[in-house]
């Protein structure tokens, strides 16, 4: 058993059928010695009284918010959460495997630059009594500071039968250089807890590997004379690490037909435009990737041909 | 420890050129391994991160652009040795930090040269022969060097005497080229900063 | 203690449907996952699915995915095996099994695919 | 396919020490607890060892398994008549639990 925060603890169980589970002592907080009662939850049944009660925790219905009563007056909580343990393996209820970049991905995070902010996101399906906390660092046995904010619903949506909620949190590095070459991973650490369940999911990364640029701004065409050919033009996201010069950007530029099975035309260039031939009827789509480390591409910026 | 006299090249930039090749060699290596050791611990959540050039070289701060020198977290070991995005080599003391910039680069390369060269004559007496370090990515190290145009100490290729465990050395392998293709990376915005200066 | 008692066994011409059942008694069954192992004559033993407590999230072995199904009904205590399309090479003793670090196995059933 | 290698057969003589190896990967026994199961002709198997090296109540203090690296043991010291079995590793590879990896199995003889 261990504390999370203030009167709340957690307690670890092989969780298998008939399992023995784990003997807790609970200790009332307060001086008082005599005629201290204990209860859980709603109920009113006194499980047993002084000022320490021993109780066998086996599954949920053994967690909860247990209370010490003096004469009707409540001296202390201490609400009691179950932390699975399956054939050597935590938990994993809670959160959805995304399965990308592989399987057994609960928690994904992302960079538009290289100052050290980044964002995670997970994914679930349980919609009430779920509360999240996250924590990071760089490395892990001498741990620098990433402060991270708190996670919040960033979408809803509806997968055949079921709602899909997700969740995210902002996280900046303390003190980042963006020219920095990365030698221990910055750790995200997400507590969740769902009714009387407690999980926790971790996940390790270079801010190097999670780069997604934004995509090019201001993207335009410009005819060319008496051809059939466009200039098409752009900029670097306003959100990308400065100076560009130092950090390149590479660009792919699309020409693409109204119907998906139609060839696309796809041209490769480190400078901010090219020149293609414009399809009736197609659009122009260009992308941004780190120039020097093949971290992933943005999302497409678009424009019509016509 | 004394820096190698510099005469950097004004026409900076065939280095430009080598340092892409270099990225690409290195990547290329680096992608090698990972497949032809697919079951030593060769990937970058697997292996421990380790800079054979740490308090050796200050590449990431000697070469670090003007712009970023505003950024406190940047500058926390050292003076304001940053290369410059003026004219190149207009004054001395620009002339004096790209000097110091391209040293490091030069001495990082050197430093890898040596220990590629090392683990290359280990990799060679592997019973198994499973991997040995691509010639074309020596090859490139090399140009680029000779690109720098620095003169400096030869240093002398380690030998062994000992049998060589030849799983620490594939780990080792993996080690070397993760950081060098970091260094690669490094390298390469240098030049391209360099370049547009 | 806890039980599991296997049933539906048999024999059955490839191609055809069968459902294993496996009730559960002695433990809250609601609580815990499941699989369904296999073993075929004179063979290894074979995972053949998994499906969580709550029946959220259900797993397949790739030679079965597509063609079986595992289900359970928590009310009645009871984990089932839908088997569709069988094939020759599904001829095995089928056992369901708890999840945990200490399990519990069923008696095991025969499915016999033959024509 | 099998993942988890076993060797086909082991035999000893009654009394002597039987060991049976079960070799993996680094995202399976390299990262994730070993139990070994005892299979008796007709029967459901057993479990003998969890954890790489607990034995549950009621299996004899002579089984005992032991993991190093990407490969994990079971030792029968002074294997008797009734030890006679057939003997599986099981564990999980991290990409893709909860599916069970078994290892291809061991026929243990016991010889005279």
């Known amino acids: 058993i261990w504390e999370l925060k203030k009167d709340v603890y957690v307690v670890e169980l092989d969780w298998y059928p008939d399992a023995p589970g784990e003997m807790v002592v609970l200790t009332c907080d307060t001086p008082e010695e005599d005629g201290i009662t204990w209860t859980l939850d709603q109920s009113s049944e006194v499980l047993g009284s002084g000022k320490t009660l021993t109780i066998q925790v086996k599954e949920f219905g053994d967690a909860g918010q247990y209370t010490c009563h003096k004469g009707g007056e409540v001296l202390s909580h201490s609400l009691l959460l179950l932390h699975k343990k399956e054939d050597g393996i935590w938990s994993t209820d809670i959160l959805k495997d995304q399965k990308e970049p592989k399987n057994k991905t609960f928690l994904r995070c992302e960079a538009k630059n290289y100052s050290g902010r980044f964002t995670c996101w997970w994914l679930t399906t349980i919609s009430t009594d779920l509360t999240f906390s996250v924590k990071s660092s760089r490395g892990s046995s001498d741990p620098q500071g990433v402060t991270c904010g708190a996670a919040t619903l960033s979408a809803e949506r509806v997968r055949g039968d079921n709602k899909e909620y997700e969740y995210s949190v902002e996280c900046q590095e303390d003190s980042a250089c963006p020219a920095a070459e990365e030698s221990l991973p910055i750790e995200v650490m997400v507590d969740a807890v769902h009714k009387l369940k407690y999980e926790n999911y971790t996940s390790s990364f270079f801010i190097r590997d999670i780069i997604k640029p934004d995509p090019p701004k201001n993207l335009q065409l410009k005819p060319l004379k008496n051809s059939r050919q466009v200039e098409v033009s752009w900029e670097y996201p306003d959100t990308w690490s400065t100076p560009h010069s130092y950090f390149s950007l590479t660009f792919c530029v699309q020409v693409q037909g109204k119907s998906k099975r139609e060839k696309k035309d796809r041209v490769f260039t480190d400078k901010t435009s090219a020149t293609v031939i414009c399809r009736k009827n197609a659009s122009i789509s260009v992308r941004a990737q780190d120039r020097y480390y093949s971290s992933s591409w943005s999302e497409w910026a678009s424009v019509p041909c016509s | 420890r004394n820096l190698p006299v510099a005469t950097p090249d004004p026409g900076m930039f065939p280095c430009l050129h080598h340092s892409q090749n270099l990225l690409r060699a290195v990547s290329n290596m680096l992608q090698k391994a990972r497949q032809t050791l697919e079951f030593y611990p060769c990937t970058s959540e697997e292996i421990d991160h380790e800079d054979i050039t740490k308090d050796k070289t200050s590449t990431v701060e000697a070469c670090l652009p003007l712009e970023l020198t505003k950024n406190e977290s940047c500058l926390n070991s050292r003076e304001t040795s940053f290369i410059t995005n003026g004219s190149c080599l207009a004054s001395r003391k620009t002339s004096f930090m790209m000097a110091l910039c391209l040293s490091s680069i030069y001495e990082d390369l050197k430093m890898y040269q040596v220990e590629f060269k090392t683990m290359n004559a280990k990799l060679l007496m592997d019973p198994k022969r499973q991997i040995f370090l691509d010639q074309n990515m020596l090859a490139v190290i090399d140009e680029l060097m000779q690109a720098l145009n620095f003169n400096s100490e030869t240093v002398p290729q380690k030998s062994s005497l000992e049998e060589p465990d030849f799983y620490k050395t594939k780990i080792k392998l993996c080690i070397l080229l993760h950081a060098f293709r970091i260094r690669a990376v490094t390298i390469d915005r240098v030049m391209s900063y360099l370049n547009a200066s | 203690q806890v039980q599991l008692v296997q049933s539906g066994g048999g024999v059955v011409q490839p191609g055809r449907s069968l459902r294993l059942s496996c009730a559960a008694s002695?433990?809250?069954?609601?609580?815990?996952?499941m699989h369904w192992v296999r073993q075929a004559p004179g063979k290894g033993l074979e995972w053949v699915a998994f499906?969580?407590?709550?029946?959220?999230?259900?797993y397949y072995a790739d030679s079965v995915k597509g063609r079986f199904t595992i289900s359970r009904d928590n009310s009645k205590n009871t984990l089932y095996l839908q088997m569709k399309s069988l094939r020759a090479e599904d001829t095995a003793v089928y056992y369901c099994k708890t999840h945990g670090s200490h399990d519990n196995w069923g008696q095991g059933t025969m499915v016999t695919v033959s024509s | 396919s099998y993942v988890l290698t076993q060797p086909p057969s082991v035999s000893g003589t009654p009394g002597q020490r039987v060991t049976i190896s079960c070799s993996g990967g680094?995202?399976?026994?390299?990262?994730?607890?070993v139990k070994w199961y005892q299979q008796l002709p007709g029967t459901a198997p057993k479990l003998l060892i969890y954890?790489?090296?607990q034995r549950p109540s009621g299996v004899p203090d002579r089984f005992s398994g032991s993991k190093s690296g990407t490969s994990a043991s079971l030792a029968i010291t002074g294997v008797q008549a009734e030890d006679e079995a057939d003997y599986y590793c099981?564990?999980?590879?991290?990409?893709?639990?909860?599916?069970?990896?078994f290892g291809t199995g061991t026929k243990v003889t016991v010889l005279g």
């Open positions: 499906i969580r407590y709550d029946g959220s999230n259900k």
């Open positions: 954890g790489n090296d």
């Open positions: 680094r995202s399976n026994i390299g990262s994730i607890t």
């Open positions: 002695g433990f809250t069954f609601s609580s815990y996952g």
């Open positions: 099981q564990s999980y590879d991290r990409g893709t639990h909860p599916a069970l990896l």
